[in-house]
């Protein structure tokens, strides 16, 4: 699987999950989240050659098409597969609230 | 929705489904499919700015991150959302067989 265990410990050039730290204020302009100040969101990057963790029959077809037509702009793209939630603290008035923001952290990628 | 109805009738620059015809022999090297000789597979293409048909909370975060960090390589990608099957005819010996190949045609796209 193209997950953090594999991707973070390898020098994989193809589609893989990459490290990305996002600071809520600096990178998003969000001031409403009190904690954490930022988080390891990660992101997906890398080419999607034929047979590389392809998501659907269509992805396989498109990767093969791209192999036969190298200059084409049609190609599968490396995108998130498994996402995890992020617990946050924010304030309603003076009262702190804890909430899970769903689908915030990328754990693995796929070619779609 | 970023579907064929909208995208094929507009000059949309952002993520949208685009027309792509794939010839099984020429583009894929497949000789086993008797009919059709090719099909309109379509593909997804275009930038994914903030608020443009974003798939998950993560996609929103990444698009916003990209807006604050324009040079970053981390950005959502335009990928298939709705896929449809394609009926094909192939031969087993001299006997024609009809089968549906699932997830072969892109009907709409999303930013993931």
């Amino acid at each position: 699987a193209l997950d953090t265990n594999y991707c973070f410990s390898s020098t994989e050039k193809n589609c893989c999950v990459r490290q990305l730290y996002i600071d809520f204020r600096k990178d998003l302009g969000w001031k409403w989240i009190h904690e954490p100040k930022g988080y390891h969101a990660n992101f997906c990057l890398g080419p999607c050659p034929y047979i590389w963790s392809l998501d659907t029959q269509y992805s396989k077809v498109l990767a093969l098409y791209n192999q036969h037509n190298p200059g084409a702009s049609a190609a599968p793209c490396c995108v998130p597969q498994a996402l995890e939630p992020l617990p946050i603290v924010y304030y309603v008035g003076r009262k702190p609230k804890v909430e899970q923001l769903s689908n915030m952290i990328v754990r693995s990628c796929k070619c779609s | 929705a970023l579907d064929t109805n909208y995208c094929f009738s507009s000059t949309e620059k952002n993520c949208c489904v685009r027309q792509l015809y794939i010839d099984f022999r020429k583009d894929l090297g497949w000789k086993w499919i008797h009919e059709p000789k090719g099909y309109h597979a379509n593909f997804c293409l275009g930038p994914c700015p903030y608020i443009w048909s974003l798939d998950t909370q993560y996609s929103k975060v990444l698009a916003l991150y990209n807006q604050h960090n324009p040079g970053a390589s981390a950005a959502p990608c335009c990928v298939p959302q709705a896929l449809e099957p394609l009926p094909i005819v192939y031969y087993v010996g001299r006997k024609p067989k009809v089968e549906q190949l699932s997830n072969m045609i892109v009907r709409s796209c999303k930013c993931s």
Epitope: K26, K31, K37, G38 | -
Partner: antibody
Framework: QVLLVQSGAEVRKPGASVKIFCKAS????????MNWLRQAPEQGLEWMGQ????????NYNGKFKGRLTLTADTSTNTAYMELSSLRSADTAMYYC??????????WGQGALVTVSS | EIQMTQSPSSLSASPGDRVTITCRAS??????LAWYQQKPGKVPKLLIY???NLADGVPSRFSGSGSGTDFTLTISSLEPEDAATYYC?????????FGGGT
């Protein structure tokens, strides 16, 4: 590299105020929270408050309410900590430390404040 | 205010020993915990952030584990230069309180 340089030692009388500075270099000062902490002689560490220099937002430890003021000058990349109505229990080493990724990763060398009559 | 309880308050061990220090939060802090090392007369040094991540330049004999309310700092094979006071600190809503030290 990241560097936080603090002002020197200070001696104050009870009831007075002290203002110490922390000059930052080697990173984006405006877009990182700056924490202030202290450590009394032979005691543990205590978090006092933090400031976001980019917009001046602050979070304070309620224990210091009304006595602690955190400010920042983005033109000189300097953070300031002012503590008023000093008492002998405020005798401590005062630290500034950059906030990063759920930790304070870089610390100043510390500024000793002695409160004595 | 979240309370951090560290144990033991002190310990004695020999070079090569495996040492474990624990820190308990009074409520769920997820993985928002850091560990520091402080030697006498010196500035605290970050060892572990986000409960399990080793800070830059920290020897691999140090490791952190846990999430929620219970956390552990482990030194797999003690070195003489590891003699110090160790503190945990939470980062789950201000004030960011520390453990009492070990």
């Amino acid at each position: 590299q990241v560097l936080l340089v603090q002002s020197g030692a200070e001696v104050r009388k009870p009831g007075a105020s002290v203002k110490i500075f922390c000059k930052a270099s080697g990173y984006s000062f405006t877009s990182s929270w700056m924490n202030w902490l202290r450590q009394a002689p032979e005691q543990g560490l205590e978090w006092m408050g933090q400031i976001y220099p980019g917009d001046g937002d602050t979070n304070y430890n309620g224990k210091f309410k009304g006595r602690l003021t955190l400010t920042a000058d983005t033109s000189t990349n300097t953070a300031y900590m002012e503590l008023s109505s000093l008492r002998s229990a405020d005798t401590a080493m005062y630290y500034c430390a950059r906030h990063y990724d759920g930790s304070t990763d870089y610390w100043g060398q510390g500024a000793l404040v002695t409160v004595s009559s | 205010e979240i309370q951090m309880t560290q144990s033991p308050s002190s310990l004695s061990a020999s070079p090569g020993d495996r040492v474990t220090i624990t820190c308990r939060a009074s409520e769920n802090i997820y993985s928002n915990l850091a560990w520091y090392q402080q030697k006498p007369g010196k500035v605290p040094k970050l060892l572990i952030y986000a409960a399990t991540n080793l800070a830059d330049g920290v020897p691999s004999r140090f490791s952190g584990s846990g999430s929620g309310t219970d956390f552990t700092l482990t030194i797999s094979s003690l070195e003489p230069e590891d003699a110090a006071t160790y503190y945990c600190q939470h980062f789950w809503g201000t004030p960011y309180t520390f453990g009492g030290g070990t």
